[in-house]
């Protein structure tokens, strides 16, 4: 029968567990992406802004999980306005705060 | 190793019935979408149906609705296409496609496919 | 119905630049697939998300989307790269799979 939604969005957060877990080396050789306000923006915003890096294979199906949340298509530097006064931070701290974000909205059902 | 293994090909004849399923392994099945793919001889490639992960959601293409009918089992890891009135034109080999998470699964890529069964409608 | 129109066959001559277009109603609005397909064999991803290669394509696959046209380019084309290409994107519902095209290696 249909699965709810939070059983895509725990599979999200999974790999962002693994990323976090499996990391050695710098993420992405320490590539830096726009801070953003993840409350306001959710996941378009969060797309957005890793949609800027290339070459890094450690992300590339965080990146292609997150278009499945996010209804339209998505280029860089397209939500620009809720980036956080032009903060940019590195990879392994966005994902870290991204997944902070997913497993707080898993918590409160938000997608139940 | 994520795998997926068709299987209920055949000869059928034009107005019968067939029933392709699909293994699946190495993901979890029941968050992500699922597509099936056909190919007639010395064609192109033509998405026939696919089935949401997240919200039970069923789509077809114009040519199959009404006749197929695409489902899933999440316990046995398993997609089914049912295809029913078939014609000669449905000859192909049909495919089954890993799709995305979400809603919007579609925006992922078709990157794990299987390796085909083949359907023949003939008299 | 929404339809994606490639051109029925490219040569290219080995280490050149082959270039495959497709083309669609405000195709650059929607994301662009391309999969490769040699004989006999099931479809390969090769680009998602319009420039975007999966882990395991060489680097000399590229893509881009804007307008109406998505374009795959191979550069530095090897005599393995010679397939079948479709693009693929998503309009009102349904998959839409462009007409392919044939990617010959000369020589």
């Known amino acids: 029968g249909p699965v709810p939604p939070s059983t895509a969005l725990r599979e999200l957060i999974e790999e962002l567990v693994n990323i976090t877990q499996n990391q050695k080396a710098p993420l992405c050789n320490g590539s830096m992406v726009w801070s953003i306000n993840l409350t306001a923006g959710g996941f378009c915003v969060a797309l957005d802004s890793l949609t800027n890096v290339s070459g890094c294979s450690a992300i590339e199906k965080t990146q292609r999980m997150l278009s499945g949340f996010c209804p339209h298509k998505v280029s860089a530097g397209q939500f620009s306005s809720l980036h956080v006064r032009d903060t940019k931070i590195e990879v392994a701290q966005f994902v870290k705060d991204l997944l902070l974000h997913l497993k707080k909205l898993f918590r409160e059902g938000q997608f139940n | 190793e994520v795998q997926l293994l068709e299987s209920g090909g055949g000869l059928v004849q034009p107005g019968g019935s067939l029933r392709l399923s699909c293994a699946a392994s190495?993901?979890?099945?029941?968050?992500?979408?699922m597509s099936w793919v056909r190919q007639a001889p010395g064609k192109g490639l033509e998405w026939v149906s696919a089935?949401?992960?997240?919200?039970?959601?069923?789509y077809y293409a114009d040519s199959v609705k009404g006749r197929f009918t695409i489902s899933r089992d999440n316990s046995k890891n398993t997609l089914y296409l049912q295809m029913n009135s078939l014609r000669a034109e449905d000859t192909a080999v049909y495919y089954c496609?890993?799709?995305?998470?979400?809603?919007?699964?579609?925006?992922?890529?078709?990157?794990?496919w299987g390796q085909g069964t083949t359907v023949t409608v003939s008299s | 119905s929404y339809e994606l129109t490639q051109p029925p066959s490219v040569s290219v001559s080995p280490g050149q630049t082959a270039s495959i277009t497709c083309s669609g109603d405000?195709?650059?609005?929607?994301?662009a697939c391309w999969f490769q397909q040699k004989p006999g064999q099931s479809p390969v991803l090769v680009i998602y998300?319009?420039?975007k290669r999966p882990s395991g394509i060489p680097e000399r696959f590229s893509g881009s989307n804007s307008g109406d046209t998505a374009t795959l380019t191979i550069s530095g084309t090897q005599a393995m790269d010679e397939a079948d290409y479709y693009c693929?994107?998503?309009?009102?519902?349904?998959?839409?799979f462009g007409t392919g095209t044939k990617v010959t290696v000369l020589g």
């Open positions: 496609v890993q799709d995305g998470l979400g809603p919007y699964f579609y925006n992922y890529g078709m990157d794990v």
């Open positions: 190495g993901f979890t099945f029941s968050s992500y979408a």
């Open positions: 089935f949401s992960g997240s919200g039970g959601s069923t």
């Open positions: 405000k195709l650059g609005d929607k994301y």
């Open positions: 998300h319009d420039s």
């Open positions: 693929q994107a998503w309009d009102s519902s349904t998959y839409v």
